[in-house]
Interface confidence: low
């Protein structure tokens, strides 16, 4: 096979956020982030080939305590496919509960042409710090 | 390209910890644990392939409770590359808050001679448990 | 090498369960989930290629708050060879504590043969959405 | 410790340039956002720009956009604020500050040098 | 024009109690805006008092609290000693990626 797809993307939104939608972006002005293969397009990730992807995402809240986000619970992360809209679906989804940050990670198969999007629903902001939040794919297999 | 690197470490500390630093060990002593490229160093891994690695870990607080969490946080366990100091930088960052146990990954760019070290700080300490906690990389791509 | 063995799977348990050990399924009627080499037998994912797997998983409590997971402590979830007994071992185990949702993921050997098995003691019931709660493995390297 | 120490300020020409330093002791540089905030005399004070932890992302207030270039080493554990086409009204002691990084997007400055003034004034 | 308001100034006895105030010169203040006060004295930088509405900060007194009073942030000093006396200012996050500050409130203890 070519080499791999892969990205790993930062967190590129402005604040205060007027929907739940993360937008995400790539590149040296954003760290450590990259798209290979993958593009993004306005803040959301595109897959360009066929095949079973690892995808991944860690998001913690900003300026958060155990005491914060239970007072503002229910705060949700929920990753899926938001378009086409006949492939839409939830693929991942966390709450944070007593914690500030969720981390995971699954198998899933995508198609050229999904978008996924990101949702964090609730009213804490997201950290921006590029080692606390990211998210990213990497192409397994056909 | 030929077999990818990987390495899947388990802790490798005497106790009481002097300093924030965990040291990894790898071997038929240390469980399930192995390195195929990257090397150990006093501890930590060496990255001897240049590439974009999966960055994974998984730390488990030893004689933990939510209450023993929250009593003494901030337990913050933090994975970076710390030489060259030129390239010195944090790559994944996670603080216990209630819990007493974090895990996540991210895929990042990574070089040859590229240190990768955890910092665990906090009074806590982590439970050597291999099924507890453990450390990995795996290379994915040039 | 042929195409990586993986496998992500869904949760396919009778409730109320009769005892800790979880259920897994694949295919169309249990969402996004599939087996490309190792095979399901009793709901339990047997592998069919030897080498070094990542082992991921997702398991959330279904109705649960922070007060719910905390009352009803110990809630832990442990994945493990549980066949044959001659390699019978823990591979990564993690607690719920005030959380309701664990996620991590690991590097590990694996052997044509090995059966892997997921437990989770306590009385609280997993989640059966699909974006919630799944287990999956990647083949990585021999 | 953290210390932080801020040096190049003096006395500079309208549309002229300067460039100030910050040194930074007692805690991991590379993992902390960093801020120039700058107080006019007898005045309050005004942010004027940020650097994430890695150097890769620079926000700045309007007043100094295009103008004024934030920038950090993390080898050298040393932050830099470059200053052009300098004006009147640039004039204050500028302060180098730690963002206390509590994963936010809101800055919040725990830790502060004891600042370097700049005078622009022909 | 300021967008944060602050009292230009305020005066305290010892051991009195004092509440300073921030509000925006266009609508009310609230925990989105992640209210935070720094304490400044003569010829020295300032320092981190409370950050989100009402954390305080390391090592700074108890006689210190943050709190939204109405629609404006307030910060109040219980028990006011001498060295108290310094000027206050409050920063608020109004847009990524900037704090406001306030044009900052002095101090007075009498004694």
């Known amino acids: 096979h070519p080499e791999p797809h892969t990205a790993e993307l930062q967190l590129n939104l402005t604040v205060p956020r007027k929907d739940p939608t993360l937008r995400w972006g790539a590149g040296p002005a954003l760290g450590r982030s990259f798209t290979h293969g993958p593009e993004l397009e306005e803040g959301h990730l595109r897959i360009h080939r066929d095949g079973i992807y690892m995808v991944h995402i860690q998001v913690t809240l900003a300026i958060c305590s155990s005491t914060t986000a239970s007072r503002h619970h229910p705060t949700t992360l929920a990753v899926g496919i938001c378009s086409p809209a006949s492939r839409s679906i939830s693929l991942l989804r966390l709450s944070f509960h007593q914690g500030c940050t969720i981390a995971s990670q699954r198998l899933t198969p995508l198609a050229r042409g999904d978008t996924l999007c990101t949702n964090l629903t609730g009213t804490l902001l997201p950290s921006r710090n590029t080692d606390e939040t990211f998210f990213g794919v990497q192409w397994v297999r056909p | 390209h030929p077999e990818p690197h990987t390495a899947e470490l388990q802790l490798n500390l005497t106790v009481p910890r002097k300093d924030p630093t965990l040291r990894w060990g790898a071997g038929p002593a240390l469980g399930r644990s192995f390195t195929h490229g990257p090397e150990l160093e006093e501890g930590h891994l060496r990255i001897h392939r240049d590439g974009i690695y999966m960055v994974h870990i998984q730390v488990t607080l030893a004689i933990c409770s939510s209450t023993t969490a929250s009593r003494h946080h901030p337990t913050t366990l933090a994975v970076g590359i710390c030489s060259p100091a030129s390239r010195s930088i944090s790559l994944l960052r996670l603080s216990f808050h209630q819990g007493c146990t974090i895990a996540s990954q991210r895929l990042t760019p990574l070089a040859r001679g590229d240190t990768l070290c955890t910092n665990l700080t906090g009074t806590l300490l982590p439970s050597r448990n291999t099924d507890e906690t453990f450390f990995g990389v795996q290379w994915v791509r040039p | 090498h042929p195409e990586p063995h993986t496998a992500e799977l869904q949760l396919n348990l009778t409730v109320p369960r009769k005892d800790p050990t979880l259920r897994w399924g694949a295919g169309p009627a249990l969402g996004r989930s599939f087996t490309h080499g190792p095979e399901l037998e009793e709901g339990h994912l047997r592998i069919h290629r030897d080498g070094i797997y990542m082992v991921h998983i997702q398991v959330t409590l279904a109705i649960c708050s922070s007060t719910t997971a905390s009352r009803h402590h110990p809630t832990t979830l442990a994945v493990g060879i549980c066949s044959p007994a001659s390699r019978s071992i823990s591979l990564l185990r993690l607690s719920f504590h005030q959380g309701c949702t664990i996620a991590s993921q690991r590097l590990t050997p694996l052997a044509r043969g090995d059966t892997l098995c997921t437990n989770l003691t306590g009385t609280l019931l997993p989640s059966r959405n699909t974006d919630e709660t799944f287990f999956g493995v990647q083949w990585v390297r021999p | 410790e953290v210390q932080l120490v801020e040096s190049g300020g003096g006395l500079v020409q309208p549309g002229g340039s300067l460039r100030l330093s910050c040194a930074a002791s007692?805690?991991?540089?590379?993992?902390?956002?960093m801020n120039w905030v700058r107080q006019a005399p007898g005045k309050g004070l005004e942010w004027v720009s940020d650097?994430?932890?890695?150097?890769?992302?620079?926000y700045y207030a309007d007043s100094v956009k295009g103008r004024f270039t934030i920038s950090r080493d993390n080898s050298k554990n040393s932050l830099y604020l470059q200053m052009n086409s300098l004006r009147a009204e640039d004039t204050a002691v500028y302060y180098c500050?730690?963002?206390?990084?509590?994963?936010?997007?809101?800055?919040?400055?725990?830790?502060w040098g004891q600042g370097t003034l700049v005078t622009v004034s022909s | 024009q300021a967008v944060v308001t602050q009292e230009p100034s305020l005066t305290v006895s010892p051991g009195g109690t004092v509440t300073l105030t921030c509000g925006l010169k266009?609508?009310?203040?609230?925990?989105?805006?992640?209210p935070t006060w720094y304490q400044q004295t003569p010829g020295q930088a300032p320092r981190l008092l409370i950050y989100?509405?009402?954390t305080r900060h390391s090592g700074v007194p108890d006689r210190f609290s943050g709190s939204i009073l109405g629609n404006k942030a307030a910060l109040t000093i219980t028990g006011a000693q001498a060295d108290d006396e310094a000027e206050y200012f409050c920063?608020?996050?109004?847009?990524?990626?900037?704090?406001?500050f306030g044009g900052g409130t002095q101090l007075t203890v009498l004694g």
């Open positions: 500050a730690r963002d206390a990084g509590y994963s936010n997007h809101v800055p919040i400055f725990d830790s």
């Open positions: 007692g805690f991991t540089f590379s993992v902390y956002y």
């Open positions: 650097i994430n932890n890695e150097g890769g992302t620079t």
């Open positions: 266009s609508g009310s203040v609230t925990s989105d805006n992640f």
């Open positions: 989100n509405t009402n």
């Open positions: 920063a608020l996050f109004i847009s990524n990626p900037s704090v406001e």
